[in-house]
């Protein structure tokens, strides 16, 4: 995310009456963890928790569906995203114990942060994929009675993970592992050095494409969405509206920090007050976005609890009604009670 | 004032080992972390590794790993640099130089701020 | 390992001159605590080097005003504003921000 990304204590506390026993890797003064790296760790904990039961359980009921189902090939995709951004979060976690500390080696430092970044770029690219196919439902269903099929589905999945890719790479070619000299300790991070420029392109591209793009496509999609359905009295649901609203303000709250803070930082000298400031930021605003990748399986479970009224059915059942089901006037993760009704009827007779 | 007296010329063969020394005074050696550099003629300066006298924990440049092993008396105030299996190339000067643990905000054992004279160590059959 | 490098290798000056060396190392110099461990040493003929400036632009005691040292990053210029016969010597960068600590070749002052 920025020049070299990694925060340690700072070791100003020297003087002659204080002279520390320096056979220890890390000064007394670290022995603490600061506070925005513990909120991370409690963050970590919970998303991988709750990320990866969920996913899996999403990635369990939907991958089934995936070769007829086109809403289950999105939410396969969107879970697998997130489903492997989860299983890197114990790196992350183990990391920030240890003050930052990485003891992985060169090779870990440069595919794991990178693999982190590629799934939670595809997770952002994938809903905005999503979003479009449900604006196209709504607005096309002509088009899409006669084009919008699997195959298309499994292309338009296929580009969301290559442009995820694509934005991934610089982080892959600038991560490097530093061995600072005192306190002895492994740093993993990007390391741009002579090319403030690229660092900045990179943070500018990234913000457009990862978040600012996205962003505008699921806002533009849910708005004209809304004003559909609300324009016709037998679809109207103030649920829908607040699960579509849930899913926008996630995104935008969850990954703000994270993009708000790079694109400073790359414009910031990091040697300046900022820079060390945002640094000692850099795992909370991780983490916050990391919200993003368990947030996904929590509004599914919620929207359908709501729409069926009560929770009578088993969970995976019910995922199944939610993210399966293949209707016109149905946008991504949001139910009106018309088509949860048909959803029903068709899942008991199967 | 603080003093780093270094031994005397040394002259060896190729596979021997020898053992530098840096005696201090003027400070309290425990409170600094000696370390060792080698200067070869046209090839500038390397650094060769460092230790804390107050516990003996050590610090290698990889390069060097194999090639010195560093010790410390406290009560000579002595720093000792011994280099095994010489060859040529390990004819240079090698000095030793402290640094200091109490200059201030943000400051650590960052630079070297009290050098040795100097040993020069010539290898040859 | 940091690769410093070191321009000119030869600098001949006349006293009263100003001088200015330039050292460029292979990766970002800034410590995680937000600091930057470049330092310059002048190693006089037949001597072991002294410390001149610590941490960019800090003299050392004793070292005089003549001296000063600036940059950031990877990018650090020593400037000597009116070079006398005693700071002929060879001129080292070196940094210690990082593992193995490493130094410049070298640039040597001398009088025309």
């Known amino acids: 995310m920025n020049s070299f990304n990694y925060t340690t204590p700072d070791y100003g506390h020297y003087d002659d009456k204080d002279t520390l026993d320096l056979n220890t890797p890390v000064d007394k003064t670290s022995n603490t963890l600061r506070v925005p790296d513990i909120l991370a760790l409690v963050i970590f904990a919970v998303v991988f928790l709750v990320g990866v039961l969920g996913n899996a359980l999403v990635v369990w009921v939907t991958a089934f569906e995936a070769k007829r189902t086109i809403n289950a090939i999105w939410f396969l995709n969107l879970a697998v995203a997130d489903f492997l951004s989860c299983l890197a979060l114990p790196i992350l976690f183990t990391s920030i114990v240890q003050h930052h500390h990485w003891p992985f080696g060169g090779a870990a430092c440069s595919i794991l942060p990178s693999l982190i970044l590629l799934n939670m770029y595809a997770s952002i690219l994938l809903l905005a994929t999503i979003s479009a196919d449900r604006f196209l439902l709504v607005f096309k269903p002509i088009w899409c009675q006669n084009f919008r099929g699997a195959g298309l589905a499994w292309i338009a999945c296929a580009v969301a993970w290559g442009l995820a890719l694509l934005l991934t790479i610089p982080s892959f070619l600038y991560r490097v592992v530093r061995e600072e000299y005192f306190p002895p300790k492994v740093l993993c991070g990007v390391d741009y050095s002579h090319d403030k420029r690229r660092e900045r392109a990179v943070a500018i591209v990234r913000l457009v494409l990862g978040f600012l793009w996205p962003l505008l496509t699921l806002t533009i999609c849910y708005t004209f969405i809304l004003l559909r359905t609300w324009s016709r009295r037998a679809t109207r649901s103030t649920k829908t509206l607040k699960v579509v609203v849930a899913v926008v303000a996630s995104f935008f709250i969850f990954w703000l920090p994270y993009q708000v803070t790079g694109i400073m930082m790359s414009f910031l000298e990091p040697s300046s007050p900022t820079f060390l400031l945002l640094n000692k930021l850099d795992s909370l605003c991780v983490s916050f976005a990391y919200i993003n990748c368990c947030i996904n399986p929590i509004i599914y479970v919620v929207a359908g609890q709501g729409f069926q009224g009560r929770l009578r059915k088993s969970l995976p059942s019910l995922l199944r009604n939610v993210l399966t089901e293949e209707s016109v006037v149905r946008e991504s993760k949001s139910f009106t009670r018309s088509t949860v009704d048909t959803m029903a009827q068709k899942t008991q007779a199967v | 004032q603080v003093q780093l007296q270094q031994s005397g010329a040394e002259l060896a063969k190729p596979g021997a080992s020898v053992k530098l020394s840096c005696k201090t005074s003027?400070?309290?050696?425990?409170?600094?972390?000696m370390h060792w550099i080698k200067q070869r003629p046209g090839l500038g300066l390397e650094w060769i590794g460092y230790?804390?006298?107050?516990?003996?924990?050590?610090k290698h440049n990889q390069k060097f790993k194999d090639k010195a092993t560093l010790t410390a008396d406290r009560s000579s105030s002595t720093a000792y640099m011994q280099l095994s299996s010489l060859t040529y190339e390990d004819s240079a000067v090698y000095y030793c130089?402290?640094?200091?643990?109490?200059?201030?905000?943000?400051?650590?054992?960052?630079?070297?701020?009290?050098w040795g004279q100097g040993t020069t160590l010539t290898v040859s059959s | 390992d940091v690769v410093m490098t070191q321009t000119p290798l030869s600098l001949p000056v006349s006293l009263g001159d100003h001088a200015s060396i330039s050292c460029r190392s292979s990766?970002?110099?800034?410590?995680?605590?937000?600091?930057?461990?470049l330092h310059w040493y002048l190693q006089r003929p037949g001597q072991s080097p002294k410390l001149l400036i610590h941490?960019?632009?800090n003299r050392f005691s004793g070292v005089p005003d003549r001296f000063s040292g600036s940059g950031s990053g990877t990018d650090f210029t020593l400037k000597i504003s009116r070079v006398e016969a005693e700071d002929v010597g060879i001129y080292f960068c070196?940094?210690?921000?990082?593992?193995?600590?490493?130094f410049g070749s070298g640039t040597k002052l001398e009088l025309k």
């Open positions: 990766q970002s110099l800034v410590h995680s605590n937000g600091n930057t461990y």
């Open positions: 230790i804390n006298p107050s516990g003996d924990y050590t």
């Open positions: 941490k960019v632009s």
């Open positions: 070196s940094q210690s921000t990082l593992v193995p600590l490493t």
């Open positions: 130089a402290r640094v200091p643990l109490s200059y201030g905000s943000g400051n650590g054992p960052y630079y070297f701020d009290y």
């Open positions: 003027g400070y309290t050696f425990t409170n600094y972390w």
